[in-house]
Interface confidence: low
């Protein structure tokens, strides 16, 4: 806000304010103030503000304060010759009151021959019948950015949604740099991205790596003077490989005897990723394995014919059991039973178209 | 099998810049991070700083002003320099490989040179 | 900076002894540790990577877990080769730093 300091006669200097030995200066200034009629103390309507010198060229300091019947910066606490101002002055339709406003440029040499452990500073000071009123301390100071980062971001790898940070000091400057960070070349904009996060010391946070966040990031510094940017630091999300489950075994390779079954897995769940590491252990298993070797039947011997029947047949048998088939062997070819003619005995073949019953003896 | 190989001179006037050179054998100074760490006598490592075969370079703030560490990939060769030395310089100075991106860590080491500073 | 803190700074132990030495980091990074050994007058090696993966050639008597801001290395079965110091190391932000050592000694 303003400070007002109310003056009458010709104390119109604070005690701060140094001598000059511009007497063609003060001459300008009133040597009284007419009391009547009464008059407020000067306001200011606009102040001037903090500027920075980019490179040679000088700045404008500006302001604005009503009622004003003159209206000076001092710098320094030194007055500012009236030459250098540049001052208008109008009647406030409204209140009648007269507005002025001034301005001065500095240049950067003005700035650079202060001596001494305070900022080139300048204000304000407006005079009315009532006494006078000093706007805040303007601050001009030369604007930089120095081109070397106090902390550039360190590449990492890392694993998937593992938190990740990446610091940046940004170089020194006048006024101090904003940052922002870049991921290949786009910026970053945590309101966008909830998973970006950028700490109140410019460091970036990226709170769960996801494999899209793979990226070169660069830390940027712009301040009025320059934009720098640090060197590039590679993030890589990499994914540790993971074995998909396990086959069903398989059947015994051997069709007789000993032999082995097996089971595969791969590393595919998930796969490796961007140098993550391959899956450790056996993506084969194998076991031992006994297949039973299947017997093939074969037929026993003919049994002797059974003794003629009362059908004038007989018969002879043999079974399949030398061996009998086992373990899926194939059975045997051919008949269990085999029967003829046969006339023994009393036995009597009947002619085919003969109605004689056959007759049997003992 | 990598190795490094530190070599230079062994003693350094104060006010003077010590100057090393490590050589990587076994392997290319392509990609890795290739570091200088100093251990003063019976005391704990310090990590100086670290080079890319790119040319990205990575210092200890707290040395960063006299530091320079530079690489001859021709050569497979890295070396520190370190201006200004005084006897608080006075250290084994190793050198050696970080591994993967800069996660490190260091896998392969030289077996270490002693630079003293004295007049 | 991230300051590594160690502890103990030495212990007295036999062979056979299964001893644990813990490192501290003043804020949190993740799994990014590695520990390793030094002999006198040798380079150190490395025994354990990103906190707790085994590097290729070290004994498994050699373990290490942790995360965030503490961190153990513990040595199953001491073995009379192991008597050495032990350094903790961070590498989740540069300047990267190393912890004040653990010197493990016979007893």
């Known amino acids: 806000g303003s400070h007002h300091h109310h003056h009458h006669g010709s104390d119109y200097k604070d005690d701060d304010d140094k001598g000059s030995q511009d007497d063609e200066f003060f001459h300008e200034l009133p040597e009284t103030f007419p009391s009547d009629p009464p008059e407020p103390l000067p306001h200011f309507l606009i102040e001037p503000e903090e500027a920075y010198i980019v490179k040679n060229k000088p700045v404008n300091l500006y302001c604005k304060a009503s009622p004003a019947t003159q209206i000076y910066f001092k710098c320094n606490s030194e007055w500012v010759h009236q030459k250098d101002h540049v001052v208008d002055e109008r009647v406030d339709e409204t209140s009648g009151l007269i507005v002025r406003e001034v301005s001065i440029e500095i240049s950067r040499q003005q700035v650079e021959e202060l001596f001494g452990p305070e900022d080139y500073w300048c204000q304000c000071v407006a005079w009315s019948s009532a006494g006078t009123t000093k706007s805040r301390k303007a601050y001009v100071r030369i604007a930089y950015l120095r081109k070397t980062f106090e902390q550039e971001p360190l590449g990492k790898e890392v694993s998937l949604e593992q938190e990740v940070l990446l610091q940046c000091r940004p170089p020194e400057g006048i006024p101090v740099a904003e940052v922002e960070w870049l991921k290949n070349e786009d910026i970053i904009d945590p309101a966008e991205d909830r998973n970006f996060y950028i700490t109140i010391d410019h460091n970036l946070i990226i709170k769960q790596a996801r494999l899209s966040d793979t990226a070169n990031y660069t830390c940027v510094a712009k301040n009025i003077v320059a934009k720098r940017k640090s060197t590039t630091a590679t993030v890589i999300v990499y994914v540790n490989g993971g074995w998909s489950t396990w086959t069903e075994w398989s059947v015994c390779n051997s069709r007789c005897g000993r032999g082995y079954q097996k089971r595969t897995r791969t590393c595919t769940n998930p796969a490796p990723l961007n140098g993550g590491a391959f899956c450790e252990g056996q993506s084969v298993q194998k076991i031992a394995c006994t297949t039973l070797c299947p017997v093939d039947g074969r037929w026993t011997s003919w049994s002797k014919w059974s003794t003629c029947g009362t059908e004038c047949t007989h018969w002879r048998r043999r079974e399949c059991t030398a061996p009998a088939p086992k373990n899926g062997g194939k059975d045997c070819d051919g008949l269990v039973l085999q029967s003829k003619n046969c006339t023994d005995g009393l036995c009597m073949q009947a002619a085919p178209d003969s109605d004689d019953v056959a007759l049997y003896g003992s | 099998q990598v190795q490094l190989q530190e070599s230079g001179p062994g003693l350094v006037k104060p006010s003077e810049t010590l100057s090393l050179t490590c050589t990587v054998s076994g392997g290319s100074i392509s990609s890795y991070f290739w570091s200088w760490i100093r251990q003063p006598p019976g005391k704990g490592l310090e990590w100086i700083g670290y080079?890319?075969?790119?040319?990205?370079?990575n210092y200890n703030p707290s040395l960063k002003s006299r530091v320079t560490i530079s690489v001859d990939t021709s050569k497979n060769q890295f070396s520190l320099k370190l201006s200004s030395v005084t006897a608080a310089d006075t250290a084994v100075y190793y050198c050696?490989?970080?591994?993967?991106?800069?996660?490190?860590?260091?896998?392969?080491w030289g077996q270490g040179t002693l630079v003293t500073v004295s007049s | 900076d991230i300051q590594m803190t160690q502890s103990p700074s030495s212990l007295s132990a036999s062979v056979g002894d299964r001893v644990t030495i813990t490192c501290r980091a003043s804020?949190?990074?993740?799994?990014?540790l590695n520990w390793y050994q030094q002999k006198p007058g040798k380079a150190p090696k490395l025994l354990i990577y990103a906190a707790s993966s085994l590097q290729s050639g070290v004994p498994s008597r050699f373990s290490g877990s942790g995360s965030g801001t503490d961190f153990t290395l513990t040595i199953s079965s001491l073995q009379p080769e192991d008597f050495a110091t032990y350094y903790c190391q961070q590498s989740y932000s540069t300047p990267l730093t190393f912890g004040g050592g653990t010197k493990v000694e016979i007893k």
């Open positions: 080079i890319h075969n790119s040319g990205t370079t």
């Open positions: 804020q949190s990074i993740s799994s990014y």
């Open positions: 050696a490989r970080g591994r993967g991106m800069a996660t490190l860590p260091f896998d392969y």
